[in-house]
């Protein structure tokens, strides 16, 4: 039962984990535009990995695609590449798990195919988790170098006759939900591998033997080895102990509407 | 039909105050910023501030912060400009002006209310 | 704060001549977000209050004559009158509407000779 509790919390877990990557993947606020000591535009910038958008104060929003594949940062492109891997590997993930589910019966499929099945669901759903946050991470690093860089710019002189208005840009919404659905998402990688062991088969059990002693006949079976790891096979007299970690998913809020000017 | 209407102006000695006034009507007041333009006699226009419609947001010229102080009353679809410490300076057709949907531009103006800033 | 400047101060053409006037900003009016410049021209006939013309500096507010029309980027924008018209005779003034506090111009007056 703890088993399939842990297996199932895992599946779950994974599945708001991905949701969220995805969600991440396609919001646009990955960098918003710094307010603080900056000059006061009448417009509010923010940007995401595939498009950069602006608010004006009537709400009026408009965004524009990068509609170019060669002429954008290497890192960006990364990023974007981190972000798609973890979203495809998150995605079949949840396909291979939807099969392993203790719960779910699919015709005489063997517990060693579950567990393997749990195990590669597991192992997708981290890497998954590491790919996301490790693409947020890439990002919120680039935001941090650019904004020290524009701060720099702004304090030592622009240089020629005309200025430009030197944005800088700061964490957006879609970080926090991208580190928060990476991290689930590794925590339900983690979950379904536990589970894993929990439905691994037992070890090669020894076959019965009869001895036949003089004068009348006992049948001798023995039980079979079983390690006292707490993760064997979960017999009706045996029970395993379910931690039952849960996870909070705070939520990063983002007014939905700035009233910037 | 988008109207506004300034009142509030008058003669005022250097040093006084004065309360201008914009009654809006013919669109939702309260989702729309807006902003007080003046233009001395003869001379071109200045705008004087700002103000978002959530009233988050408030900005002023230079010349006049410190001194003015713009409000809204989004629940009587009114504008309010107080001015305080008025110097000759000051003297000036006001303008109440809407904030447009489309590029920050001011696409309504109302035809403005003389302000007169002398001993 | 942004200073804008227009030139020529006044300018006085014949009926259906092509003027253009010139607005230069201080700095940059261009944002690269949405590739829009936030530069507004207006028009103020005489004892009337100022009338939008144009935002984006290129857009053309409804119910404007399609002989306005505006151009430019980053710093310097042109207002075009394409057939001067007796109605045009006015005050134009430009404004940057991309850092507060916002600024216009010193207006370019049109008569008509």
């Known amino acids: 039962m703890a088993v399939t509790a842990c297996q199932g919390l895992g599946f779950v877990v994974s599945l708001i984990g991905i949701a969220g990557i995805i969600a991440a993947t396609c919001m646009d606020q990955w960098s918003t535009q710094d307010l603080y000591n900056n000059p006061v535009t009448a417009v509010f910038n923010y940007q995401g990995l595939w498009r950069s958008c602006v608010r004006e104060s009537s709400g009026f929003t408009e965004c524009r695609g990068y509609f170019t594949l060669l002429g954008l940062p290497a890192m960006l492109q990364a990023v974007r590449a981190l972000m798609i891997v973890g979203i495809v590997l998150g995605a079949i993930g949840l396909l291979v798990s939807i099969f392993a589910l203790k719960c779910i019966r699919i015709g005489s499929m063997e517990d060693s195919a579950k567990a393997n099945m749990t195990l590669t669901s597991g192992i997708m759903f981290i890497v998954s988790g590491l790919c996301a946050i490790a693409g947020v991470s890439v990002f919120a690093n680039m935001l941090v170098t650019n904004f020290w860089m524009s701060t720099a710019n702004m304090y030592t002189g622009m240089g020629g006759m005309v200025q430009t208005v030197q944005t800088r840009y700061t964490f957006g919404a879609a970080l926090f939900v991208g580190w928060v659905a990476g991290g689930l998402t590794l925590i339900g990688g983690v979950m379904m591998c536990i589970a894993c062991r929990g439905l691994a088969p037992e070890e090669t059990n020894y076959k019965a033997v009869s001895y036949h002693a003089s004068g009348h006949s006992v049948a001798y079976k023995p039980g079979g080895f079983k390690a006292s790891t707490g993760f064997g096979s979960n017999t009706k007299n045996k029970k395993i102990y379910d931690g039952g970690a849960r996870t909070e998913d705070e939520v990063q809020s983002y007014p939905s509407k700035h009233d910037y000017v | 039909e988008v109207q506004l209407v300034e009142s509030g102006g008058g003669l005022v000695q250097p040093g006084g105050s004065l309360r201008l006034s914009c009654a809006v009507s013919?669109?939702?007041?309260?989702?729309?910023?807006m902003h007080w333009v003046r233009q001395a006699p003869g001379k071109g226009l200045e705008w004087v501030a700002y103000i978002s419609s959530g009233t988050t947001n408030i900005y002023y010229a230079d010349s006049v912060k410190g001194r003015f102080t713009v409000s809204r009353d989004n629940a009587k679809n009114s504008l309010y400009l107080q001015m305080n410490s008025l110097r000759a300076e000051d003297t000036a057709v006001y303008y109440c002006?809407?904030?447009?949907?489309?590029?920050?531009?001011?696409?309504?103006w109302g035809q403005g209310t003389l302000v007169t800033v002398s001993s | 704060d942004i200073v804008m400047t227009q030139s020529p101060d006044s300018l006085a053409v014949s009926l259906g001549e092509r003027v253009t006037m010139n607005c230069k900003s201080s700095q940059s009016l261009f944002q690269s977000g949405n590739q829009r410049n936030y530069l507004t021209w207006y028009q103020q006939k005489p004892g009337q209050p100022p009338k939008l013309l144009i935002y984006?500096?290129?857009t053309r507010e409804s119910g404007v004559p399609d002989r306005f029309s505006g151009s430019g980027s980053g710093t310097d924008f042109t207002l075009t009158i394409s057939s001067v018209q007796a109605e045009d005779v006015a005050v134009y003034y430009c404004q940057n509407v991309y850092i507060y506090p916002l600024t216009f111009g010193q207006g370019t007056k049109l008569e008509i000779k």
């Open positions: 002006v809407r904030s447009g949907y489309y590029g920050q531009s001011l696409d309504y």
């Open positions: 013919g669109f939702t007041f309260s989702s729309f910023g």
């Open positions: 984006w500096a290129s």
